[in-house]
Interface confidence: low
Amino acid sequence: EVEKTACPSGKKAREIDESLIFYKKWELEACVDAALLATQMDRVNAIPFTYEQLDVLKHKLDELYPQGYPESVIQHLGYLFLKMSPEDIRKWNVTSLETLKALLEVNKGHEMSPQVATLIDRFVKGRGQLDKDTLDTLTAFYPGYLCSLSPEELSSVPPSSIWAVRPQDLDTCDPRQLDVLYPKARLAFQNMNGSEYFVKIQSFLGGAPTEDLKALSQQNVSMDLATFMKLRTDAVLPLTVAEVQKLLGPHVEGLKAEERHRPVRDWILRQRQDDLDTLGLGLQG
């Protein structure tokens, strides 16, 4: 904590400007009015303050706003955001997407920090759901964001937001997350024609039930093995050999290389040997 000392004569700050970089920590504490700082936060980022000086500025804001900063200040925090703790951020009420973007920009290129994670948490909770603009923004900064959400949190994603999701955004999703996302994707893409629909729905198929896989098998989709290997085992097991052959098309030969891995292994064990032999791949049930 910086000691309370009187501001030397003539040093009282009238505005936030570059002259302040020459102030010692105690002078900043004594000579910069917290309310002035709050109203001129947008200037702080243009001034090359040291980390120690930024600590003092943060301390002043903390004293002025013990219950949490107002959004007008948060939006202009800039690099001062990196000084905030998750506990600080939990006091905030961030509702503007512009504020969120401004702070994510500060952290751009870095791994998602607990601070950023908490900020996003507060923002999404404040909005009540993950709308398309928010999802667009978050996945642009953090492609893995969607797969960081619990199934319950994903349930608040409206189907319209699914249009913002790219295949790479789902790379780290687990089956329970895809279980929630798949019905939303199905709804979002329902008016597309067969081949276009498959391109869009493919990344979400880890949440598809058996009946949907059966329906896809009738549409000459030629699913690749990588997608097939991500399907739910319980959804694949009831498929017949003929259905799997139609589903995979020319990729059916890849089953041989995957015969020891789930879901292929379990599916093979469910089939009659005569049916497997029709594939001509030497699969043993």
Partner: nanobody
Framework: QVQLQESGGGLVQAGGSLRLSCEAS????????KAWFRQAPGKEREFVAS????????AYADSVKGRFTVSRTYAKNTVYLQMNSLKPEDTAVYYC?????????????????WGQGTQVTVSS
């Protein structure tokens, strides 16, 4: 309701390693195990490590950084704490905690469910 069951504690010599596990059962779609805290005799419970839903975001107490690693699996709703280079001051009862938010956090108030704890004793 969520039930948390810790295991893997025990007696180990200084410099040794242990791996704690915490398995969750019950309403785990909403609440999932994501943090470890510890409490030494006569001291307050303190934060050790936390992990986010996706498994890539983590947070650690300064005292364990570089020695402890938190990780989790999806299918079994299990969170792990790999403890290496153990010191006598790591001796404590280790508790697993489950919460609903997806960000890792050191704030014990963010966790709704707690395990019974597993004893870790590091002898010199």
């Amino acid at each position: 309701q969520v039930q948390l069951q810790e295991s893997g504690g025990g007696l180990v010599q200084a410099g040794g390693s242990l791996r704690l596990s915490c398995e969750a059962s019950g309403h785990t779609d909403s609440y999932y195990p994501k943090a470890w805290f510890r409490q030494a005799p006569g001291k307050e419970r303190e934060f050790v490590a936390s992990i986010g839903w996706g498994g890539r975001m983590t947070a650690y107490a300064d005292s364990v950084k570089g020695r402890f690693t938190v990780s989790r699996t999806y299918a079994k709703n299990t969170v792990y704490l790999q403890m290496n280079s153990l010191k006598p001051e790591d001796t404590a009862v280790y508790y697993c905690a489950a919460g609903i938010g997806w960000a890792p956090t050191a704030d014990s108030g963010e966790y709704d469910y707690w395990g019974q704890g597993t004893q870790v004793t590091v002898s010199s």
